[in-house]
Interface confidence: low
């Protein structure tokens, strides 16, 4: 299944972002690489990578099936990386499958990418 890529994804709650039409000339936001799809087995560990860059440094949010991903101690976590953000899910369960989306904003622009865990 192909990775879905959108700069104005429907999954971004409209009230979450107030995007200025007057962009600062020095600011930019780029999706460097589409998110990877993952096929794995129960009990294994999966990682999804959101590769973005920008100025000012972007803030990245994770969604699963349109809901904010909430970290679960010792099982589900996300953290900043030099390339953006990494979402890791340990001890995979059938309920972990779905569409995972990262949404990055620098306060003026938004980019997003969606990957599938199945």
């Amino acid at each position: 299944q192909e990775t879905e890529l959108s700069v104005s994804a429907e999954l971004v709650p409209t009230s979450s972002w107030n995007i200025s039409s007057e962009l600062n000339k020095d600011s930019y936001l780029t999706l460097d690489e589409p998110m990877n799809n993952i096929t794995t087995s129960l009990g294994q560990t999966a990682e999804l990578h959101c590769k973005v860059s920008g100025n000012p440094p972007p803030t990245i949010r994770w969604f699963k099936n349109d809901a904010p991903v909430v970290q679960e101690p010792r099982r589900l976590s996300f953290r900043s990386t030099i390339y953006g953000s990494r979402l890791r899910i340990r001890n995979l369960d059938t309920t972990d499958t779905g569409y995972f989306q990262c949404v990055a904003t620098n306060g003026k622009e938004v980019v997003s990418s969606t990957g599938v865990l199945f």
Partner: antibody, heavy 114, light 107 residues
């Protein structure tokens, strides 16, 4: 436009159950989580849990484990929250709220009194 | 569970005042924080997402700052319609937890 319309006020006796409905319009119910939040009179907000109407998955605040049930009827774009074994301290306004807490229902007052 | 505390619990201010409300988390929540405004008898309304991002339709006099454990909501010039109770919410870990609220009333 997006709207969440909740059922009317309820008065229940201790030990009974209450089921509150939340009808969604203006968006697709099945692709947005629905949170339930309650607020006791004069008190703060308390997250109860969510349901993902697309598949019926739920996540609850452990405080309510075993007492709360969240369901949905996608044919009428409605989510439900049922709270059982009611106590007087369950008297509160119960709200539904969409995925990112961007839209809320008007609230349903549930009064538990003998 | 992550505990959220807010200060002050209440404050009195005048129209035009600069108002600052703080929210503190018992552990690092990154910037997984939402600020809400609630008026009596009404549902909460989201103001700020992800600690610093203004929600659509919210006046620019509202701003959010902070990350980790310490967060601030600032109203740069208080307007009559801003008298209300303000809550923070962390969505870093389950269960999601709200702060106890800060009531802003007229001096």
């Amino acid at each position: 436009q997006v709207q969440l319309v909740q059922s009317g006020a309820e008065v229940k006796k201790p030990g009974a159950s209450v089921k509150v409905s939340c009808k969604a319009s203006g968006y697709t119910l099945t692709t947005n989580y629905m949170h339930w939040v309650r607020q006791a009179p004069g008190q703060g907000l308390e997250w109860m849990g969510w349901i993902y109407p697309g598949n019926g998955n739920t996540k609850f605040n452990h405080k309510f484990d075993g007492r709360v049930t969240m369901t949905r009827d996608t044919s009428i774009s409605t989510a439900y929250m049922e709270l059982s074994r009611l106590r007087s301290d369950d008297t509160a306004v119960y709200y539904c709220a969409r995925s990112d807490f961007d839209y809320w229902g008007q609230g349903t007052l549930v009064t538990v009194s003998s | 569970d992550i505990q959220m505390t807010q200060s002050p619990s209440s404050l009195s201010a005048s129209v035009g005042d600069r108002v600052t409300i703080t929210c503190q988390a018992s552990q690092d929540i990154g910037n997984n924080l939402i600020w809400f405004q609630q008026k009596p008898g009404k549902a909460p309304k989201s103001l700020i997402y992800f600690a610093t991002s203004l929600a659509n339709g919210v006046p620019s006099r509202f701003s959010g700052s902070g990350s980790g454990t310490d967060f601030t909501l600032t109203i740069s010039s208080l307007q009559p319609e801003d008298f209300a109770t303000y809550y923070c919410l962390q969505y870093r870990e389950y269960p999601l937890t709200f702060g106890p609220g800060t009531k802003v009333d007229i001096k």
